[in-house]
Interface confidence: medium
């Protein structure tokens, strides 16, 4: 009889029990598996997925995906992205790959995750005086107000403002009057001038001279080029001949000599090393740029799979040959490993020494040298004006400095001349002509140098020599010799510039040329009626007198007891008395000299606050206030 | 004739791998060198690496390094490629293609084989 | 990104004649890489049309032409045809990839 095996409930996890014979099968419900289904599918536990990735499992719970975060990728999200693949950072910034993201390292001016943000280089504002601030790229660019100038309007635009000087010439101020330096090429008081710069001798060859600012340019006739047009055209200053290509100049052509690698007419193309089948014996040919190299298969070795993987002495009997003659031309073969190969003599190549190695090929001699081949070696024959192992070098006849009075020396095969700059001529430029005659320019009918100044000549041009108290190319400004300082400091009240010459006014108390002697005011003795003198360089007179009782005045020359100092205002009397004279006001007025009211606010109770003194005035609200330290205002408030 | 054919289109699934089968005929297989080259829909053409039948070297491009095998089988006159860890960018017509020197042009190309990635 | 650019479309009317440049660098065609051009029309496989820089297959048109100069080489059509509208591809070589295989990102031909 059969027996149900599933009476027993044998299948967990509400599987169903199929009974069978001599046995039963469980059918599972996911997630569950196994005999009697007591295997739980969980595939996302543990995660496999790395780096916070959420893990998923299929359907079938026999498999899982991971879904990645922001910057990883991969099966198990193991791979770092990398963003910077995708060029994030902006206005040139650097991108560096980290784990998860990626950071921005801004170029100078830029900020942002992806420096995106153009900083704001006017915050705080930079520009001075009242100039207005425009953002820029890590700058900032002020608009100044008028009168000020600069980067950042830190400037005050001085007296030149007017800018009287031409073609980017400095402007020195004078005074009433300025002068001109002129930059190199440019002339005149003004430097409106530009100077000429061609000379009969500037361009060779029949060259046409262009004048420049303190240069010049030559228009050359077919046939010849160089700045002066002293080469006759070589077809290789256009450096024709690429990859480093030897280039022959020819008439009217030229013939590139290419090194090992490249061919074409300008040595353009890599040589297809390939297509002449060097491999022998079945070897692949694997070119790698201007090199190959052949794969050989078993059994062949050597350069070109033309060695057969034996010894040097079965190779020699395999080709009839005693071993010391195998390697042709006295090479050496040497056994290695299970093949051998040859040892050449200087000067042969290939496998079995059998090639005549060329030295001339392709030609290391240059400048229309001939090339010799010998063993191991070759040599260079030059054409005249060129020398080197390769004839590279040309000689330089301008080495001896034959052009005079800054003439230019152009070296050329074999020879050289001299362009000459104005005002020289010969052919080593030794010529200096006299460019201080005539003494008045012929052209403006001025002198060429203003204010008594000397000429004195130079190479293309002149120079003046000022008398004192003038400056300028021509003499022309008037030196302001104030600017100087000359005055001493303390005892100058004012410096006046003169014709070549300054004048100090001095502060009182002070003499000397530049005030700078104290004057002794008490030498003459000026104090009368037994007064006691004390030096005072800070007063007008240079002395103060100390009176004795009962007389007063700057040299104590009044009687205080007499009315003949004391002046009574506002029609008061003077009466005298034993030791000082005193005035007798009218009605409505009071003090010393009846100067103040007698209704001033001081005497009906003190005005002032914080300990403030009152003090009557003449004019109206008739007092003031004298504030102690710490206080100020009308009222000492 | 001189011709490259390929083996047929294929559907993956992300993460597994694809091998194609590209067999020489009509001329020596061990003289030129094989390329596999890739378009996906709507990009241009992508080499991914270069085979010498003659003794299975290879040189493969850097961006599937790692990823990508490629065989030579002289007796059947066929190379293969292998490509693993599909993701959906690997959809694209994949081509064998052959050259005479390991610098040389492409002038005979397979059909292309088809490679769906998808889940 | 293809290291070889070329422009994305170019067209032309029948009988017209157009060009398409390829631009690399000193690392590929300056270096003395040759460059070779392959027409791909859609569903076939790529058909070399003009190899180591200006050369003709046999069987190409002499209505395709083709330079190289520089760092830089271009394909002229001429007499342009209706069966020639298709994708144009320029390849070579590059040293700093170590000789990898460089692609142009291809030209599409429109005849109006």
């Known amino acids: 009889t059969n027996i149900n095996e599933c009476a027993s409930n044998p299948c967990l996890n509400q599987g169903t029990c199929i009974d069978d014979v001599a046995g039963y099968k469980c059918n599972c419900l996911l997630p569950y598996t196994g005999a009697t289904c007591e295997v739980v599918l969980a595939p996302c536990a543990p995660s496999p997925c790395r780096n916070g990735g959420e893990c998923r499992q299929s359907e079938d719970y026999e498999s899982f995906s991971c879904v990645c975060p922001t910057g990883w990728q991969g099966q198990t999200c193991e791979v770092d992205i990398n963003e910077c693949v995708l060029s994030p950072c902006r206005h040139g910034a650097s991108c560096q790959n980290t784990h998860g993201g990626y950071r921005c390292h801004c170029q100078a001016g830029y900020s942002g995750r992806n420096c995106e943000t153009d900083i704001d280089d006017c915050r705080p504002n930079p520009c001075h005086n009242g100039g207005s601030c425009t953002d820029g790229i890590n700058t900032a660019f002020c608009d100044c107000l008028p009168g000020f100038r600069g980067t950042f309007c830190e400037e005050d635009i001085n007296e030149c403002a007017s800018d009287p000087c031409r073609n980017g010439a400095n402007c020195t101020d004078c005074v009433d009057s300025y002068t001109c330096t002129c930059p190199a090429g440019f002339s005149g008081i003004h430097c409106e001038n530009n100077t000429p710069d061609c000379t009969e001798s500037s361009c060779f060859n029949g060259g046409t001279c262009v004048d420049g600012i303190n240069s010049f340019t030559c228009l050359c006739p077919p046939g010849f080029t160089g700045s002066y047009c002293q080469h006759d055209v070589n077809e290789c200053d256009s450096q024709p001949c690429l990859h480093g290509g030897t280039c022959q100049d020819g008439c009217g052509s030229y013939r590139c000599t290419c090194p090992q690698g490249y061919t074409g007419p300008n040595c353009q193309n890599l040589v297809h090393w390939c297509d002449s089948s060097p491999c022998k014996n079945g070897g692949k040919c694997w070119q790698t740029h201007t090199q190959y190299r052949c794969e050989c298969p078993s059994g062949w070795t050597g350069l070109y799979c033309d060695v057969p993987s034996v010894s040097c002495e079965v190779a020699a009997q395999r080709q009839g040959v005693d071993v010391a003659r195998l390697c042709q031309h006295g090479g050496l073969c040497v056994d290695a490993g299970n093949t051998h190969h040859c040892r050449c003599q200087a000067g042969y190549t290939g496998s079995y020494c059998e090639d005549l190695v060329d030295e001339c090929s392709p030609s290391p001699c240059q400048n229309g040298a001939t090339c010799t081949d010998y063993l191991g070696g070759y040599s260079c024959k030059c054409v005249a004006g060129y020398h080197g192992v390769n004839c590279s070098e040309e000689i330089d006849e301008c080495l001896s400095h034959p052009c005079q009075n800054g003439g230019t020396c152009l070296d050329l095969p074999n020879t050289y001349k001299c362009s000459c700059p104005r005002g020289t001529q010969g052919v080593h430029c030794e010529i200096n002509v006299d460019d201080c005659n005539p003494p008045v320019d012929p052209v403006s009918r001025s002198p060429k140098c203003f204010n008594n100044g000397t000429c004195v000549d130079q190479v293309g041009g002149y120079s003046c020599t000022c008398p004192p108290g003038f400056v300028g190319e021509r003499c022309e400004g008037d030196v302001n010799e104030c600017l100087s300082n000359p005055c001493d400091a303390r005892g100058t009240q004012n410096c006046v510039q003169r014709v070549n010459d300054f004048h100090c006014e001095c502060r009182a108390g002070h003499t000397g040329r530049r005030c700078e002697s104290v004057i002794n005011g008490c030498k003459g003795k000026p104090c009368k009626n037994g007064g006691t003198c004390a030096v005072a360089s800070n007063t007008a007179r240079g002395f103060i007198c100390k009176c004795p009782a009962g007389f007063e005045g700057a040299t104590c020359e009044n009687d205080a007891r007499t009315c003949g100092s004391l002046r009574c205002l506002n029609g008061g009397t003077c009466i005298s008395g034993p030791r000082s004279p005193t005035c007798l006001c009218l009605g409505p007025f009071t003090g010393p000299e009846c100067q103040f009211p007698a209704s001033s606010p001081c005497l009906g109770g003190n005005p002032c606050y914080n300990q403030g003194t009152c003090e009557p005035t003449s004019e109206s609200p008739f007092y003031r206030c004298l504030c102690p330290a710490k206080f100020n205002g009308l009222l000492c408030h | 004739q001189v011709q490259l054919v390929q083996s047929g289109a294929d559907v993956k699934k992300p993460g597994a791998s694809v091998k194609i089968s590209c067999k020489a005929s009509g001329y020596t297989f061990t003289k030129y060198y094989m390329h596999w080259v890739r378009q996906a829909p709507g990009q241009g053409l992508e080499w991914m690496g270069i085979?010498?039948?003659?003794?299975?070297?290879?040189s493969y491009a850097q961006k599937f390094q790692g990823r990508v095998t490629m065989t030579s089988d002289t007796s059947a006159s066929t190379v293969s490629m292998e490509l693993s860890s599909l993701r959906s960018e690997d959809t694209a017509v994949y081509y064998c293609?052959?050259?005479?020197?390991?610098?040389?042009?492409?002038?005979?190309w397979g059909r292309g084989t088809m490679v769906t990635v998808s889940s | 990104q293809a290291v070889l650019t070329q422009p994305s479309s170019v067209s032309g009317a029948p009988g017209q004649r157009i060009t398409i440049s390829c631009t690399g660098t000193s690392s590929n065609i300056g270096a003395g890489y040759d460059v070779e051009w392959y027409q791909h029309l859609p569903g076939t496989a790529p058909k070399l049309l003009i190899y180591?820089?200006?050369n003709r297959p046999s069987g190409v048109p002499d209505r395709f032409s083709a330079s190289k100069s520089g760092t830089s080489a271009s394909l002229v059509i001429t007499g342009l045809q209706a069966e020639d509208e298709a994708d144009y591809y320029c390849?070579?070589?590059?040293?700093?990839?170590?000789?990898?295989?460089?692609f142009g990102g291809g030209t599409k031909l429109t005849v109006l």
């Open positions: 180591r820089n200006s």
């Open positions: 085979i010498n039948p003659t003794n299975g070297y290879t």
């Open positions: 390849q070579s070589y590059d040293t700093r990839l170590s000789d990898s295989v460089i």
């Open positions: 293609t052959r050259s005479y020197s390991n610098y040389d042009s492409f002038d005979i």
